[in-house]
């Protein structure tokens, strides 16, 4: 396993401003199709505000107006739904505020009574606004591969909306999933859009598909379940991540690291730095600076991505995603190349190369 000399000396080079993360549930703004929506970025003392939607930079267009701390969406459509963020860049730090936009004419019930056969637990939606099924939060469904230790329980969820309220059924490896297909069967809770399998065994491995449908359409989503027979291992990092990246001065870049670990992993982003003109200490170990580490309130989503905004030449170099658990440490590295700013718009490219 690798050894590192972590640099604590803050006089090395200008520190990246610390980033504050919002740890509460994002606020949800609801609009009906065709309506206009105005949201104010709830950050104080914002010198410069940048906006993103679903992690992608958001610029003004014929329907999106960005004025100071306000975002206006004119004539909203369902495609405007998603996770938005405004980031206030200040001299000493940057802060990001997240919020959800849900453009829908469907208002679903919050009824949580226990059910046996499903759909009657929902209050019917506005009968004038028919709508095919849709996922209420696609971002939470991004992770498709799930490794669960044998003898534990797995819960698959596919929260959806639609009008009339859709029904849900489950497939295993593309075929109807029946209770008799596994010892102990499974449990479904339609009001939570969930399927639970208790005490999983290796024969439960496979693809599980939720099919959500009403008379106006059908959608489906597949999760892959891997049942891990316990042989403790250090964290596994997804091959190819983080990927090498390049950007121009002033641009933004992000590195992504996907970590799989049965034991609770501790994840850090580290930059290889120089001290007194050298990348290595007298012991031959690299000088490193911890840029970001998982805290008690840090979500998987937050720690898996390292954002570097308003890149300078000093940001160029090697970045390492390091994950450790009680068994050991794994790490992948990637390089950031910073190019001079041309007269045109900044560009970001990424290649799948990585170093281990």
């Amino acid at each position: 396993r690798p050894s590192f000399s972590l640099v604590e000396d803050t006089t090395l080079e200008p520190e990246e401003p610390p980033t504050k993360y919002q740890i509460s549930q994002p606020e949800v703004y609801v609009a009906a199709p065709g309506e206009s929506l105005e949201v104010r970025c709830l950050l104080k003392d914002a010198a410069v505000i940048s906006w993103t939607k679903d992690g992608v930079h958001l610029g003004p267009n014929n329907r999106t107006v960005l004025i100071g701390e306000y975002l206006q969406i004119k004539g909203a459509t369902p495609r405007d739904s998603g996770l938005y963020a405004c980031t206030a860049s200040r001299t000493v730090d940057s802060e990001t505020w997240y919020f959800m936009v849900n453009v829908t004419d469907a208002i679903s019930s919050g009824d949580d009574e226990d059910d046996t056969d499903g759909a009657e637990d929902f209050v019917s939606e506005n009968s004038n606004n028919k709508r095919a099924p849709y996922w209420t939060n696609t971002e939470k469904m991004e992770k498709r591969l799930h490794a669960v230790p044998a003898a534990n329980t797995v819960k698959f969820r596919c929260p959806a909306g639609g009008n009339p309220m859709p029904t849900m059924r489950w497939l295993k490896n593309g075929k109807e999933f029946k209770q008799e297909h596994r010892i102990g069967g499974y449990k479904v809770r339609n009001q939570h859009w969930s399927l639970i399998m208790e005490s999983v065994v290796p024969s439960d491995k496979g693809n599980y598909t939720c099919v959500v449908e009403n008379e106006y359409g059908s959608i489906n989503h597949t999760y892959h379940l891997d049942v891990v027979e316990r042989s403790p291992h250090r964290p596994i990092l997804q091959a190819g991540l983080p990927a090498n990246a390049s950007t121009v001065v002033g641009g933004d870049v992000e590195f992504v690291c996907k970590v799989y670990s049965d034991a609770q992993p501790h994840i850090q982003w580290i930059k290889h730095v120089e001290k007194n003109g050298s990348k290595y200490g007298p012991d031959g170990l690299p000088y490193l600076k911890v840029l970001k580490a998982a805290g008690v309130n840090t979500t998987d989503k937050e720690i898996e991505v390292l954002y570097i905004r308003n890149v300078t030449f000093e940001d160029a170099g090697e970045y390492t995603c390091l994950a450790g658990n009680s068994i050991g440490i794994s790490f992948h590295s990637a390089w950031l190349t910073v190019l001079p700013a041309p007269g045109r718009e900044k560009e970001i490219t990424a290649s799948p190369d990585y170093l281990e």
Epitope: V148, A151, P159, A263
Partner: antibody
Amino acid sequence: EVQLVESGGGLVQPGGSLRLSCAASGFPFTSQGISWVRQAPGKGLEWVGRTHLGDGSTNYADSVKGRFTISADTSKNTAYLQMNSLRAEDTAVYYCARTYGIYDTYDKYTEYVMDYWGQGTLVTVSS
Amino acid sequence: DIQMTQSPSSLSASVGDRVTITCRASQDVDTSLAWYKQKPGKAPKLLIYSASFLYSGVPSRFSGSGSGTDFTLTISSLQPEDFATYYCQQSTGHPQTFGQGTKVEIK
């Protein structure tokens, strides 16, 4: 049949130490976890900590962090709660409970459920 | 820490009554909530997990519902063996926390 049997409780002076044992049988020991929960006389339940028997990872309540240590001997199917620097407020019945995870694919957290409990062992901290 | 508040703290009921106990979390715990039953001098027993899933071997007169911050345990027809103290417990946040308990007594 799943069984958990605690032992090791007793009277100890403030500042003293005690080690509780939880002997488990009837389930694949290294697949799941053991939690310790305590109950002061006439009071409610308080979670103390948890270990995952497969990888040895542990979590503790703030009130015991740095004083209590959870460990396990998988060859003996036994979990332990080592209690140091004991205080009067640690007086309670201590339960061990088999703990399994519900892995939520949507919110990506693990819900921990304690489904089998031992009979409890009383720890009294008094001078 | 996430605070769990149960109400009522105690209640008196008769055999055959429908009993409802509520549990409120100080912040969103999704559906990561369990209910336990404890008789005096005995260890707790798991009744419900993931807010609404009945644990194996638990009579179907017990049911759970709710998500987010508000949860309910319902006993549809109280039986003599149901007189006990009931606890809710969340485990989505660290540390896991229990409610203060609801004592169900014979009227």
